[in-house]
Interface confidence: medium
């Protein structure tokens, strides 16, 4: 019951807390169980006891074994056991299961990944974070105190996250790494009949002959990841690609995931060098998913240039 598993990598710092708790004023004695040999408290030793903490600075594979801690008070003694395993460093990126700390789950609203065991160490910010052995880069990732925050969490963010920090002991620095899996909970994603946000139905768009014009078709499809969501433009009921007018092209706009979690798509229709005949066409913004198709129609009208009188 009062036994705790601890593990670490060779040549890294490992600090283990006695599984039996006591007041700071209580003395704690540590022993190597196999030999019943007392662990020294002098900090010049590579392995030494410091109250409730047992420190391996740094750890070696040979340190593996069961350590006994006895918490002594004036009225009682409490005994705990720390089962310590020190592993050789892996040559490849793969982190084996036995080196993994507990899995944490995150979601769009809560995406904190705490660095395991870090509170036992004397460390200073910043923490370094890696996912599947790759250093995390980009504004979505923020190392904050002892945890990592991921903005706009996606299912792709699931994986193994490793935190790396430096433990300082009397001016000497020791590296520590800890890895845990992160899973992403789908916060009740759903799919709904497409909702076109722009353009408005039967909108009239004013354009200038000879100038360029852009029309944006924007639609939302639900929350979370969507299967088969599409936004496209048609001209007179024909796909742009089949219409055969090189001046008129569609290109993807921004994927959007609004703060309320809605999944939306944009498609921009670009008309170069607007001509009179473009005013005669019917422009349809189509949004489609598994539930159905929604269509908003736009027509172009000539914008009269403003007369500038002297």
């Amino acid at each position: 019951k009062f036994s705790k598993q601890s593990w670490g990598l060779e040549n890294e710092a490992l600090i283990v807390r006695c599984p039996r708790q006591g007041k700071p004023s209580y003395t704690v004695d540590w022993y190597y169980s196999q030999t019943n040999k007392s662990i020294p408290t002098q900090e010049r030793n590579r392995v030494f006891a410091s109250g409730q903490l047992l420190k391996f600075l740094p750890a070696a594979v040979a340190d593996s074994g069961i350590y006994t801690c006895i918490v002594r008070s004036p009225t009682f003694n409490r005994t705990g056991y720390a089962n310590v395993t020190i592993y050789k460093k892996q040559s490849d990126c793969n982190v084996p299961d036995y080196l993994m700390y507990s899995t944490v789950s995150g979601s769009e609203k809560n995406s904190k990944i705490y660095c395991p065991t870090i509170d036992l160490y004397n460390w200073t910010a910043p923490l370094e974070w890696f996912k599947n052995c790759q250093a995390l880069q980009g504004s979505r990732y923020r190392a904050h105190k002892s945890f990592l925050v991921i903005d706009n969490v996606m299912t792709e963010d699931a994986g193994d996250y490793t935190c790396k920090f430096i433990h300082n002991e009397n001016g000497a620095n020791y590296s520590v790494t800890a890895t845990r899996s992160f899973t992403v909970k789908d916060e009740q994603g759903f799919s709904l009949f497409p909702v076109i946000g722009a353009p408005a139905q039967n909108e009239i768009k004013e354009v200038e002959i000879g100038k360029n014009a852009n029309l944006t078709c924007s639609a939302c499809f639900g929350k979370g990841t969507q299967f088969l969501a599409a936004v496209l433009w048609q001209l007179n009921g024909t796909k742009i690609t089949d219409f055969g007018e090189p001046r008129i092209q569609q290109e993807e706009g921004q994927n959007q995931s609004f703060s309320n979690g809605l999944a939306c798509l944009d498609m921009v229709l670009r008309i170069a060098d607007v001509k009179e005949e473009d005013l005669l066409l019917q422009y349809d913004c189509l949004a489609l998913n598994l539930h159905g198709l929604r269509r908003h129609t736009v027509r172009l009208s000539r914008k009269n240039p403003i007369d500038h009188h002297s």
Partner: antibody, heavy 126, light 106 residues
Framework: QVQLVQSGAEVKKPGASVKVSCKAS????????INWVRQAPGQGLEWVGI????????TYAQKFQGRVTMTRDTSTSTVYMELSSLRSEDTAVYYC???????????????????WGQGTLVTVSS | DIQMTQSPSSLSASVGDRVTITCQAT??????LNWYQQKPGKAPKLLIY???SLESGVPSRFSGSGSGTDFTLTISSLQPEDFATYYC????????FGPGTKVDIK
């Protein structure tokens, strides 16, 4: 004519990652979504996920979430499927397949995979 | 997820035989069902979409029927090139395939 050409066979060790490519030609790349389907030796077909070249949207089968990443490069009309933390049971032929649907029906239901890549054998072995 | 089952899992037939393969869905999928043919070492090939629509270039001896939960693929007169494995796939939601039916020579 429409073609989906996949990258060559790969042999990987457990725990490694693999990235398979699928180059599309003969049609407008951004118009059709691309799916990935895998087939273990002697087994049936298993859907892995979908990517929309127009916008890069992805949806993955629950089984692969957290291990699969699909991306696309519109400049080369190529989609990629990367699978990480490989295990022996990931040994399979991985196919890319174009998804089509009749917009006249007014919905995406009724989609079908009309063109397939030739397949890429990924072998995971220690 | 919608689960798909197929029967039989394999069958032996002769050239000229009429062959019927059935596919069942665990929920009503209307007519959103496709059929594919796969030969050893090759990619699947679309035969039928939306339960009964024949893909262009596919011989008319192939036909599909059914709606709701029960579907059938029929080969009216089996040809030598038809010996293969056949898969059904629902397209009502994210795709799931049946386990396949292998048609081999008797």
């Amino acid at each position: 004519q429409v073609q989906l050409v996949q990258s060559g066979a790969e042999v990987k060790k457990p725990g490694a990652s693999v990235k398979v490519s699928c180059k599309a030609s003969g049609y407008t790349f951004s118009t059709y979504d691309i799916n990935w389907v895998r087939q273990a030796p002697g087994q049936g077909l298993e859907w892995v996920g979908i990517i929309s070249p127009s916008g890069g949207w992805t949806t993955y089968a629950q089984k692969f979430q957290g291990r699969v990443t699909m991306t696309r490069d519109t400049s080369t009309s190529t989609v990629y499927m990367e699978l990480s933390s490989l295990r022996s049971e990931d040994t399979a032929v991985y196919y890319c397949a174009r998804v089509n649907y009749d917009i006249l029906t007014g919905q995406g239901r009724g989609y079908y995979f009309d063109y397939w890549g030739q397949g890429t054998l990924v072998t995971v072995s220690s | 997820d919608i689960q798909m089952t197929q029967s039989p899992s394999s069958l032996s037939a002769s050239v000229g035989d009429r062959v019927t393969i059935t596919c069942q869905a665990t929920q009503d999928i209307a007519d959103y069902l496709n059929w594919y043919q796969q030969k050893p070492g090759k990619a699947p090939k679309l035969l039928i979409y939306k339960a009964s629509s024949l893909e262009s270039g596919v011989p008319s001896r192939f036909s599909g029927s059914g709606s709701g939960t029960d579907f059938t693929l029929t080969i009216s007169s089996l040809q030598p090139e038809d010996f293969a494995t056949y898969y059904c796939q629902q397209s009502y939601s994210t795709p799931t395939f049946g386990p396949g039916t292998k048609v081999d020579i008797k």
